[in-house]
Interface confidence: low
């Protein structure tokens, strides 16, 4: 709330000169007035345009006491209309009004640009009463003015539900130019035109703009703000700024770096994260992007094998994440891997090549000539097969996996057996009589389990019957 400092009634003469508490700035001068009858203003500031007609609201008070004497209209006295000052200076301005003593407890409020100024503002109201009227001076002070203090200030007083409004006091805070738009850093294509924008405001206006490139002025004649600088093109990095000038002085914008887009630097630190028989997971650290965002990357893979034709496999991938799983590789093979990335300008050189290997694969063929016999005397099933013809990449044979499924009267049960790589026969115990036994065999290497052979079925009768099943896959060359 606005603080009020009421003073005791003091026998001030009506026009002795400036009243205590009235404050002057460079823009105001107190007028000495002849002593005239009626309610002549006790205090008056010279308006910006002397003699201009008064435009404030007027309240016409009436007194209904004996004699029905009519009081003259109430109005704020003219004051300075326009205060111009520099940023960070202090300012104090006031409005004054003489109010007949019939009106008690009037309050004055300050408003700026249509909004009431509440709270921690330096507003003081002083009262100078005499017999018939009280001169009221409302002062408003701002320390270290800022641009945000610019605006139109008025006083308002409420009497008998009528509002009396003063003439506005325009505060204009002048200072160095203030940037509303500064040039922005850019990444541009070599020898391609681009624009930079600079805008600054006062007051005071006008604001003139000079452009600076690498510490040298670009334009000899200033341009009125706002200014757009068209640069026809650059071949190397440059730093631009703009200077804004007004009557108060000069403000320099931030310097912005204009970079020339170039092809990226090659990726670095290509790393192997994981290898399987047919894939390798790699990552890399992207090189400098050449001031243009990466678009995509290319993973280049060469088989390191004297017998290979030296062809390069190329896998395109997004630039992020900096990781790629290379698939469709041969098992147990050596590869040389490089990465290159591109931006809008072009492709980087390839990263340093790194060596990587795939692991053993699983066998690709099943054991051959699988035959199954029932050995009734021992109550077991004999199984025989031929070693599959595996490729080197499948790795070393470590054994076989035998699947035997027993089916009887709607019940099915699968069992698995593992045998060593030197075996080409196995015996399994009969699990159920009067049932079908289906046998399949797969070769196993460190790389995994290969495909199972075609199923071979044998019927296990009740005791006293013998059955024999043929081989599942004929040996090569057999009809």
């Amino acid at each position: 709330a606005i603080t009020e400092a009421r003073e005791e009634a003091k026998p001030y003469p009506l026009f002795p000169g400036p009243l205590p508490g009235s404050l002057q700035t460079d823009h105001t001068s107190l007028l000495s007035l002849p002593h005239t009858s009626g309610y002549q203003p006790a205090l008056m500031f010279s308006p910006t345009q002397p003699g201009r007609p008064y435009t404030g609201n007027v309240a016409i008070p009436r007194v209904t006491s004996a004699g029905s004497k009519l009081l003259p209209p109430l109005a704020f006295k003219h004051t300075v209309g326009h205060i111009i000052l520099s940023e960070h200076k202090d300012v104090k301005f006031n409005c004054s009004i003489s109010v007949p003593n019939i009106y008690q407890d009037t309050t004055i409020s300050w408003w700026k640009d249509g909004k009431e100024l509440l709270g921690a503002h330096h507003a003081i109201t002083q009262f100078y009463p005499d017999d018939e009227v009280t001169a009221i001076i409302a002062s408003f002070s701002i320390t270290s003015v800022q641009r945000s203090d610019n605006g139109s200030y008025i006083c308002k007083m409420k009497i008998n539900n009528e509002e009396i409004v003063s003439d506005p006091i325009y505060i204009e805070v002048q200072g160095l130019p203030h940037f509303t738009k500064q040039p922005e850093s850019m990444n541009v294509t070599r020898n391609t035109a681009f624009n930079l924008t600079c805008q600054a405001v006062g007051p005071p206006e006008p604001v003139n703009i000079f452009w600076v490139q690498n510490s040298s002025r670009v334009n000899e004649q200033p341009e009125k703000s706002p200014s757009v600088l068209t640069v026809p093109g650059l071949t190397e990095m440059a730093v631009f700024s703009c200077e804004a000038h007004n009557d108060k002085g000069l403000t320099v914008s931030k310097g912005v770096q204009i970079n020339i887009k170039a092809i990226p630097s090659p990726p670095t630190e290509v790393s192997i994260h994981n290898s399987t028989a047919h894939s390798i997971l790699i990552s890399w650290v992207p090189g400098f992007d050449g001031y243009s965002p990466f678009r995509n990357c290319s993973v280049q893979v060469k088989e390191v094998d004297p017998l290979s034709n030296g062809s390069v496999m190329i896998f395109n991938t997004s630039a992020s994440p900096h990781m790629y799983q290379i698939k469709q590789l041969q098992a147990l093979a050596n590869y040389s891997i490089g990465v290159s990335c591109m931006n809008e300008i072009g492709w980087s050189a390839v990263s340093p090549w790194i060596l990587a290997s795939t692991t053993e694969g699983a066998p690709s063929v099943a054991p051959l000539n699988v035959t199954v016999f029932l050995n009734e005397s021992r109550d077991n099933v004999d199984i025989r097969w031929m070693k599959p013809l595996t490729k080197r990449q499948a790795g070393e044979l470590v054994g076989y996996r035998i699947s035997h499924v027993w089916q009887s009267a709607g019940i099915s049960k699968e069992l698995l057996e593992e045998v060593g790589q030197n075996n080409s026969r196995a015996q399994i115990s009969v699990q159920v009589h009067n049932a079908t036994c289906t046998v399949r065999i797969a070769a196993v290497t460190k790389g995994g389990v290969g495909p199972f052979s075609d199923p071979v079925k044998i019927f296990i009768p009740a005791h006293g019957w013998v059955d024999h099943a043929p081989s599942s896959t004929p040996a090569p060359g057999n009809a």
Partner: antibody, heavy 122, light 106 residues
Framework: QIQLVQSGPELKKPGETVKISCKAS????????MSWVKQAPGKGLQWMGW????????TYTDDFKGRFAFSLEASASTAFLQINNLKNEDTSTYFC???????????????WGTGTTVTVSS | DIQMTQSPSSLFASLGGKVIITCKSS??????ISWYQHKPGKGPRLLIH???SLQPGIPLRFSGSGSGRDYSFSISNLEPEDIATYFC????????FGAGTKLELK
């Protein structure tokens, strides 16, 4: 191999000046900004600011404005931290650290120096 | 400024075991957090950035997760060379570090 090698320990008196160095190798020095980080004994790490290794423009955090100065000798791929008018509370280990992103709004440190211990004692 | 609260300040663990360290930020840091390992006499080493992205060459035993204001870092199958101090760094708004967690053997 990317590395940042810092100068050796320093013993100074209050009021004196110290200048410590951070020599980079294994990468393009002027492509990655260089930061400085302070670790006082028994305290956590404090980011002091960074220097643009291309333009040489330093940026200081609020706590390190005034007595601290970052500089470069780009031809030698070396960054420097100078502390003027040393105080007892400057006794710390100072690390240089490379910012990970070359051109990015958000960045962290991917390579650090081994640290330089500065002791200020009368 | 954003504050980073790291816990615990020290931790005793067994070889082969798992440890979890957390960092809580004073406001949402949009997953912009990195984790470092620091051994005496050496410079800190970047392990993880962007909450969970493992730096090349860092073993898969190290991992990170989190979002918003809560982030965690873990080491599984602890090895002797993992004994060090670990700290986090937020880089969403300026840069602030966690106070660090000293990892020791039980």
């Amino acid at each position: 191999q990317i590395q940042l090698v810092q100068s050796g320990p320093e013993l100074k008196k209050p009021g004196e000046t110290v200048k410590i160095s951070c020599k980079a190798s294994g990468y393009t020095f002027t492509a990655y900004g260089m930061s400085w980080v302070k670790q006082a004994p028994g305290k956590g790490l404090q980011w002091m600011g960074w220097i643009n290794t291309y333009s040489g423009v330093p940026t200081y955090t609020d706590d390190f404005k005034g007595r601290f100065a970052f500089s470069l000798e780009a031809s030698a791929s070396t960054a420097f931290l100078q502390i003027n008018n040393l105080k007892n509370e400057d006794t710390s280990t100072y690390f240089c650290a490379r910012r990970a992103a070359v051109v990015a709004k958000y960045w962290y440190f991917d390579v650090w120096g081994t640290g330089t211990t500065v002791t200020v004692s009368s | 400024d954003i504050q980073m609260t790291q816990s615990p300040s020290s931790l005793f663990a067994s070889l082969g075991g798992k440890v979890i360290i957390t960092c809580k930020s004073s406001q949402d840091i949009n997953k912009r957090i990195s984790w470092y390992q620091h051994k005496p006499g050496k410079g800190p080493r970047l392990l993880i950035h962007s909450t969970s992205s493992l730096q090349p060459g860092i073993p898969l035993r190290f991992s990170g997760s989190g979002s918003g204001r809560d982030y965690s870092f873990s080491i599984s199958n602890l090895e002797p060379e993992d004994i060090a101090t670990y700290f986090c760094l937020q880089y969403d708004n300026l840069l602030t570090f966690g106070a660090g967690t000293k990892l020791e053997l039980k």
